[in-house]
């Protein structure tokens, strides 16, 4: 569950569940910073614009990131 705030981390809970790349509207990867000491991955779904915090350590999520970056490299000229 993401939570808006001015400082510190955004994700309150994280999901190990894989997400279908086709159902993704947006995938945000927020690197660790002075405000939050961990990488955060926030998926925005096409359906209802629902958001989900993903577990960067999950194998399924790592595979998702690979699939998305592969798709992006196909699209780029």
């Amino acid at each position: 569950v993401p939570l808006s705030r001015t400082v510190r981390c955004t994700c309150i809970s994280i999901s190990n569940q894989p997400v279908n790349p086709r159902s993704l509207e947006k995938l945000e990867i927020i690197p660790a910073s002075q405000f939050c000491p961990r990488v955060e991955i926030i998926a925005t779904m096409k359906k209802k614009g629902e958001k989900r915090c993903l577990n960067p350590e999950s194998k399924a999520i790592k595979n998702l990131l690979k699939a998305v970056s592969k798709e992006m490299s196909k699209r780029s000229p």
Partner: antibody, heavy 121, light 109 residues
Framework: QVQLVESGGGVVQPGRSLRLSCAAS????????MHWVRQAPGKGLEWVAL????????YYADSVKGRFTISRDNSKNTLYLQMNSLRAEDTAVFYC??????????????WGQGTTVTVSS | EIVLTQSPGTLSLSPGERATLSCRAS???????LAWYQQKPGQAPRLLIY???SRATGIPDRFSGSGSGTDFTLTISRLEPEDFAVYYC??????????FGPGTKVDIK
């Protein structure tokens, strides 16, 4: 099965301290934010505190800020609430609840049975 | 801080009737952040509806949620004996506190 079990409640004098525990089982505790919610006798629900899945984020209701501390031990699958400077108005049933992670906000989907705290001289 | 108001305070109905419960917020709440809970005497609350309109796992389809902005509604299409309880709405806005409404008691007429 998915379960939360609170303990540590009891009768305590005003100004004293108490620590509540919540033992989690049946799910990946270390992935879930956790809440404490209380209910005074005959009253409604009051959100008390929230801690993020890895303990980095902590949030409190104004009524307990500076007196209560939420914490967790993911290696023990346990949530805590340290309550200091207790007042008569803190008398309530205290529930721990899971913040469901599979969506933007799916509410508090698992609750414990509650533990009763009575603050009285 | 967002304040939630629920009406009516008590709703007296008979089994089989339709119940309409209202939850009003003092400022706009994203639909993603509005939940409804049921609580029976001596029991912990149970999540019914999340995201204003999505039923939680195992919740019968006679329960439905709707609304957006500041006005939200929980509807029980046909009251069953086990539905007589107190119902709370809760907002999980962009920052704490994550307030609950004062509750609506649905009792038997």
């Amino acid at each position: 099965q998915v379960q939360l079990v609170e303990s540590g409640g009891g009768v305590v004098q005003p100004g004293r301290s108490l620590r509540l525990s919540c033992a989690a089982s049946g799910f990946t505790f270390s992935n879930c934010g956790m809440h404490w919610v209380r209910q005074a006798p005959g009253k409604g629900l009051e959100w008390v505190a929230l801690i993020g899945y890895d303990g980095i984020n902590e949030y409190y209701a104004d009524s307990v800020k500076g007196r209560f501390t939420i914490s967790r031990d993911n290696s023990k699958n346990t949530l805590y609430l340290q309550m200091n400077s207790l007042r008569a108005e803190d008398t309530a049933v205290f529930y721990c609840a899971r913040d469901w992670p599979e969506g933007y906000y799916n509410g508090m989907d698992v609750w414990g049975q509650g533990t009763t705290v009575t603050v009285s001289s | 801080e967002i304040v939630l108001t629920q009406s009516p305070g008590t709703l007296s109905l008979s089994p089989g009737e339709r119940a309409t419960l209202s939850c009003r917020a003092s400022q706009s709440v994203s639909s993603s952040y509005l939940a409804w809970y049921q609580q029976k005497p001596g029991q912990a609350p149970r999540l019914l509806i999340y995201g204003a309109s999505s039923r939680a796992t195992g919740i019968p389809d006679r329960f439905s949620g709707s609304g957006s902005g500041t006005d939200f509604t929980l509807t029980i299409s046909r009251l069953e004996p086990e539905d007589f309880a107190v119902y709370y709405c809760q907002q999980y806005g962009s920052s704490p506190p994550f307030t609950f409404g004062p509750g609506t008691k649905v009792d038997i007429k």
